[in-house]
Amino acid sequence: NQDLPVIKCVLINHKNNDSSVGKSSSYPMVSESPEDLGCALRPQSSGTVYEAAAVEVDVSASITLQVLVDAPGNISCLWVFKHSSLNCQPHFDLQNRGVVSMVILKMTETQAGEYLLFIQSEATNYTILFTVSIRNTLLYTLRRPYFRKMENQDALVCISESVPEPIVEWVLCDSQGESCKEESPAVVKKEEKVLHELFGTDIRCCARNELGRECTRLFTIDLNQTPQTTLPQLFLKVGEPLWIRCKAVHVNHGFGLTWELENKALEEGNYFEMSTYSTNRTMIRILFAFVSSVARNDTGYYTCSSSKHPSQSALVTIVEKGFINATNSSEDYEIDQYEEFCFSVRFKAYPQIRCTWTFSRKSFPCEQKGLDNGYSISKFCNHKHQPGEYIFHAENDDAQFTKMFTLNIRRKPQVLAEASASQASCFSDGYPLPSWTWKKCSDKSPNCTEEITEGVWNRKANRKVFGQWVSSSTLNMSEAIKGFLVKCCAYNSLGTSCETILLNSPGPFPFIQDNIS
């Protein structure tokens, strides 16, 4: 039918960027590229009905169902969902196509179902049917990749037993240290499961699916590098595969490599060697030690020896269960308003942890960095000098860990005052927690120097706002001070602030700010 418009239906998946820090909350979403829903004319239906492919959405995900209409003239539209009409506002894109969108924020069970879009154009009327279901994410898994030797080949296969099936990539780097960061130009990524080039400096395999990304580094001892001050340590759980690569470069081929476990040569079938000439004609040899499924007795010192290099060792520790080792005692910090400061947690963990920093019910991304001594560190610097309670939470498959921090910002008190018919109260959040004085202003004491001691009740830290303490002082009204101006002052080691209150009749009182440093 030539009168029918050309229409395209797409699904746009939005990544909820809740953890974004300092971004405008009016646009918290990052969109993925649209997926075609292949709108097709529904056969044997009365009227013109297009049907989009059904869509499956994760709980709490945000999506847009969008229709692009290539038809002349204006269009009007109406969305219908569960017999309710929903507002529809078409607009035109740069190619002058009509665009109609339905945004579903934070998908819930109640938002699943059939969405009908009725479109009226100058030429014709038609209906588009969308079906939206909730995806069963309970079945999702993302497992850390592991290595296997390829049968009859000198190559490694990277395996991640995850659902949905992950995209597996090798991340290779031939530089040292910092230049091997993920975004560095020295890093090469290969989206394949099998790797033949095993001579690189740094070799990692990563697997990613809807749940995120997990990586495993090929543990390497480089005999041409100065050994670390502390012995490198590798943790594995019973049943996991062990892979250690020993690498050495020499001016010619006249050298050999061997592996020993606790001074005993590894059995045949637990190692394989590869060698190549580098661009400057030096010989590179690598010798892999591997155990397909480790047991407790595979624990020990693995030593790689060379006839031309000093030998180096690594301690392999086989554990029954994963762990997170760190001190969980809470820590309090007191800093100045403009002082640079980061919280940090030093921990040893296996398998690698997933972690978050939380403040004021908001979660922030957590970065970890490996240290030379086998420990890792996570730092959080983005506190923006907000006092309160900060929480570090880490977990892996077998263990959980939580550590609390309190941040106090040294500052002069700021005073807020309020009054009722029977009392006046002043509040301050300065730190260190302030002390209070009340003074009466009268003809005898125009500078408000007459101190009030009767009827004063101080409460330190009466209100805890996400770990931020607030101090208050209340003055009970007596006949002696009714009708007078009184002044409450909060002072600490950084200064004093005062607020003046007129004690006359009930209701809100005007405050006269009067700061004295």
Partner: nanobody, 125 residues
């Protein structure tokens, strides 16, 4: 790249039953939403049934609802279509189909990325 191979078609009497199978090879089966389509002689290919990648959700054409059941066994890399109470109008070549996304279910032909070669089902007395 995914290869799909259907089997189980044949001649069956009206009211009878038949089970179609679709074996997949190539990239792991569990990543795909899968479906069955059919094409009767002289007609366009039409949607019959679909199943999400996890097997959690199923979708059927109105004409087969209550009679056909789609299922999958990810451990065997196989998709099934159990057809009961077959009618003459179910006669067609049945195609196994896979999509390229875990979010979009193969309920319309344009989203199909991979097709099987088809298996003929004839319902006749």
């Amino acid at each position: 790249e995914v290869q799909l191979l259907e089997s189980g078609g044949g001649l069956v009497q009206p009211g009878g039953s038949l089970t179609l199978s679709c074996a997949a090879s190539g990239r792991t089966f569990s990543s795909y939403a899968l479906g069955w389509f059919r094409q009767a002689p002289g007609k366009e290919r039409e949607f019959v049934a679909a199943i999400s990648w996890s097997g959690g959700n199923t979708y059927y054409a109105d004409s087969v609802k209550g009679r056909f059941t789609i299922s999958r066994d990810n451990s065997k890399n196989t998709l099934y279509l159990q057809m009961n109470s077959l009618r003459a109008e179910d006669t067609a070549v049945y195609y196994c189909a896979a999509g390229g996304s875990t979010r979009v279910v193969v309920t319309t032909t344009p989203v199909v990325k991979y097709w099987g070669q088809g298996t003929l089902v004839t319902v006749s007395s």
